[in-house]
Interface confidence: low
């Protein structure tokens, strides 16, 4: 593994424990200047394997809001625009950090938490099964 | 709106201020227990537009390893296992949260940080702009 | 839960200009956009402008390109929409919300809407 040295100017902390707690500036940093502004603006619309997104808000969480997509069909959008259920829409799920208010109801106080969310729909050939 | 009562037992602090820093807790907890740990794991290579993952490792970062979805090719695999490029592969992009050192090598001190990554690609009909 | 309030909408002349303001509550962070849609008389709600809360970039729908401007106050939790070159057709009540940014989708996914404002262009 890669060795860091420590920063002489890093804050105190008594925690010398892993789990540990840290302090965390939530004045968000945002690293995407070079992406295009429209990036994938429309697939959810234009795919083969469409998708709807829908709200889901915690005010315990943070960020409160994250928006989940579901697939509109269990079939795939073929060249005449019908569904195609030799094919399958199925969701692309990823593995995201969020912050959980801890104790509840801190403004302050937060723990680390991996919530599943579902991002968009790929058009997937089927698994199957054939019986001996 | 939902106005939460505050938890007398909050760690107490000074900072009036949005955007703060704030505690957290490293030790993550895990929402995902109900999930087919299957999931998603072999769509990249079923999909109609399938993808190559690209492991993005960042010892400043927490998570420090990510992995980047690439679209194996920019037309869709047909019925015949041919690339279609009368359709287009691309990537669903999603804004995540991590962790940054800051000031950088500390241990003990982040800063929210926004990233872009691609978790997969789908399979989009073309934009096709006709010439007047 | 997230509260939106909107103001700036009157009545005015075709070619003039108007500035509408979005007053947000209740939002603790939005890694994602606000967005500004219209309803027309007689049509169904439309997506207008969107801007990211973070990075601050833009997008709009074709019909206002150019015309329309969409800007964000992060401190005062505030977002704006300035509207030049005001057309007939650009009459509508103005309703502001938070959304996936780029993804004008579904309407009834949004958070609970506000009142609006209203915007009317006489010729």
């Known amino acids: 593994g890669i060795t860091i040295p420590r920063n002489p100017g890093c804050p105190n902390s008594e925690d010398k424990n892993f789990p540990r707690t840290v302090m965390v500036n939530l004045n968000i940093h945002n690293r995407n200047t070079n992406t295009n502004p429209k990036r994938s603006s429309d697939y959810y619309n234009r795919s083969t394997s469409p998708w709807n997104l829908h709200r889901n808000e915690d005010p315990e969480r943070y960020p409160s809001v994250i928006w989940e997509a579901k697939c509109r069909h269990l079939g795939c959008i073929n060249a005449d625009g019908n569904v195609d259920y030799h094919m399958n829409s199925v969701p692309i799920q990823q593995e995201i950090l969020v912050l959980r208010r801890e104790p509840p109801h801190c403004p302050n106080s937060f723990r680390l938490e991996k919530i599943l969310v579902s991002v968009g729909c790929t058009c997937v050939t089927p698994i199957v099964h054939h019986v001996a | 709106g939902i106005t939460i009562p505050r938890n007398p037992g909050c760690p107490n602090s000074e900072d009036k201020n949005f955007p703060r820093t704030v505690m957290v807790n490293l030790n993550i907890h895990n929402r995902n227990t109900n999930t087919n740990p299957k999931r998603s794991s072999d769509y990249y290579n079923r999909s109609t537009s399938p993808w190559n993952l690209h492991r993005n490792e960042d010892p400043e970062r927490y998570p420090s390893v990510i992995w980047e979805a690439k679209c194996r090719h920019l037309g869709c695999i047909n019925a015949d296992g041919n690339v279609d490029y009368h359709m287009n592969s691309v990537p669903i992009q999603q804004e995540i949260l991590v962790l940054r050192r800051e000031p950088p090598h500390c241990p003990n001190s982040f800063r929210l940080e926004k990233i872009l990554v691609s978790v997969g690609c789908t399979c989009v009909t073309p934009i096709v702009h006709h010439v007047a | 839960q997230v509260q939106l309030v909107e103001s700036g909408g009157d009545l005015v002349q075709a070619g003039g200009s108007l500035r509408l303001s979005c007053s947000v509550s209740g939002l603790r962070v939005s890694s994602y956009a606000m967005g500004w849609f219209r309803q027309a008389p007689g049509k169904e709600r439309e997506f207008v402008a969107a801007i990211s809360w973070v990075g601050g970039d833009t997008r709009y729908a074709d019909s206002v390109k150019g015309r329309f401007t969409m800007s964000r106050d992060n401190a005062k939790k505030q977002v704006y929409l300035e509207m030049n070159s005001l057309k007939p057709e650009d009459t509508a009540v103005y309703y502001c919300?938070?959304?996936?940014?780029?993804?004008?989708?579904?309407?009834?996914?949004?958070?609970?809407w506000g009142q609006g404002t209203q915007v009317t262009v006489s010729s």
């Open positions: 919300n938070d959304m996936p940014y780029g993804m004008e989708t579904r309407m009834d996914d949004y958070a609970s």
